[in-house]
């Protein structure tokens, strides 16, 4: 039985050219986390494997940094980064838990509330 829940930063906004932390937290399960995948729509951004550590997809190496923790930091944001992001927790024996975050990248003058949603 899958008892776990994923807590995410939810819907967030950030300024163009800035950076943002995407964060998910798995709780309410003692299942072993074997790997966490970060995906944007159908594109793999990064993998954190329990044994092998982090792997950042080559096409995102310049703008994606691992952490903090199992989170992901996106840098040098562009308007094209707007969209859905998914954290996918692969666990044993439960299976897969998925969290969703919607990021909106705004022109500097518009993103006045974005900071409220960022995790320090």
């Amino acid at each position: 039985m899958m008892t776990g829940t994923i807590e995410t930063t939810g819907n967030i906004s950030a300024e163009k050219g800035g950076s943002i932390i995407l964060q998910c937290h798995l709780s309410s399960t003692t299942a072993q986390v074997t790997q966490v995948n970060w995906e944007q729509q159908d594109q793999l951004l990064a993998i954190c494997n329990a044994d092998l550590g982090w792997h950042i997809s080559p096409s995102f190496k310049d703008r994606v940094a691992p952490g903090p923790g199992l989170g992901l930091t996106l840098q040098s944001l562009t308007v094209n980064d707007t969209g859905e992001y998914f954290c996918i927790y692969h666990t044993y024996p439960d299976g897969t838990y998925t969290g969703r975050i919607f990021l909106e990248v705004l022109e500097s003058s518009v993103a006045e509330h974005g900071a409220r949603f960022q995790i320090p």
């Epitope: 709780s27 309410s28 072993q32 329990a50 923790g69």
Partner: antibody, heavy 116, light 108 residues
Framework: QVQLKQSGPGLVQPSQSLSITCTVS????????VHWVRQSPGKGLEWLGV???????DYNAAFISRLSISKDNSKSQVFFKMNSLQTNDTAIYYC??????????WGAGTTVTVSS | QIVLTQSPAIMSASLGERVTMTCTAS???????LHWYQQKPGSSPKLWIY???NLASGVPARFSGSGSGTSYSLTISSMEAEDAATYYC?????????FGAGTKLELK
């Protein structure tokens, strides 16, 4: 203020069962899991099991045959029962709240001595 | 199960001294799921450092934590009398959840 208050007997006869109640305040049992951990001089800190916000449980395989954890959300109480106690079950038993896979607040503990 | 080995078992430090204790896991632990608790005699354990390096509320900034994989450590930059206690590492990576045997830190 988040608190977990424990009540239960201090002395248990060998082969008898142990029942401890953990009454929580400052948060709802429908939102957080509560774990049970014991501490003895011989074995240190041992995780025993957990009851999740939805009411399902996970147990340490070493104790699954004689351990039961339940709760009453309306009374903010978690109930711990362990059967067939032996002298090596003598320990301090703690309940603790889980947040993001760590224990942020612990009860004061219930000291249990198994002796005839 | 994951065995956590803490060293040293007992150590003493003078006021102002830098203190480091280690926790070695028998298999890899994701750093987000390695935590430290402080316990003083007659009291229950208190969350001290969570997810390897984050200080719990009220913990002095002289404490820090680091590590990854199978090797973790807790450091006190300058020992104070109130730091005398036993420190336990704890993994929530895999069931059964386990704790180290503790490092007892005494004031010299």
């Amino acid at each position: 203020q988040v608190q977990l208050k424990q009540s239960g007997p201090g002395l248990v006869q060998p082969s008898q069962s142990l029942s401890i109640t953990c009454t929580v305040s400052g948060f709802s049992l429908t939102s957080y899991g509560v774990h049970w951990v014991r501490q003895s001089p011989g074995k240190g800190l041992e995780w025993l099991g957990v009851i999740w916000s939805g009411g399902s449980t996970d147990y340490n395989a070493a104790f699954i045959s004689r351990l039961s954890i339940s709760k009453d959300n309306s009374k903010s109480q978690v109930f711990f029962k362990m059967n067939s106690l032996q002298t090596n079950d003598t320990a301090i038993y703690y309940c603790a709240r889980e947040v993001r896979r760590y224990f942020d607040v612990w009860g004061a503990g219930t000291t249990v001595t198994v002796s005839s | 199960q994951i065995v956590l080995t803490q060293s040293p078992a007992i150590m003493s430090a003078s006021l102002g001294e830098r203190v480091t204790m280690t926790c070695t896991a028998s298999s890899s632990v994701i750093s987000s799921y390695l935590h430290w608790y402080q316990q003083k005699p007659g009291s229950s354990p208190k969350l001290w450092i969570y997810s390897t390096s984050n200080l719990a509320s009220g913990v002095p900034a002289r404490f820090s934590g680091s590590g990854s994989g199978t090797s973790y450590s807790l450091t006190i930059s300058s020992m104070e009398a109130e730091d005398a206690a036993t420190y336990y590492c704890h993994q929530y990576h895999r069931s059964p959840l386990t704790f180290g045997a503790g490092t007892k830190l005494e004031l010299k």
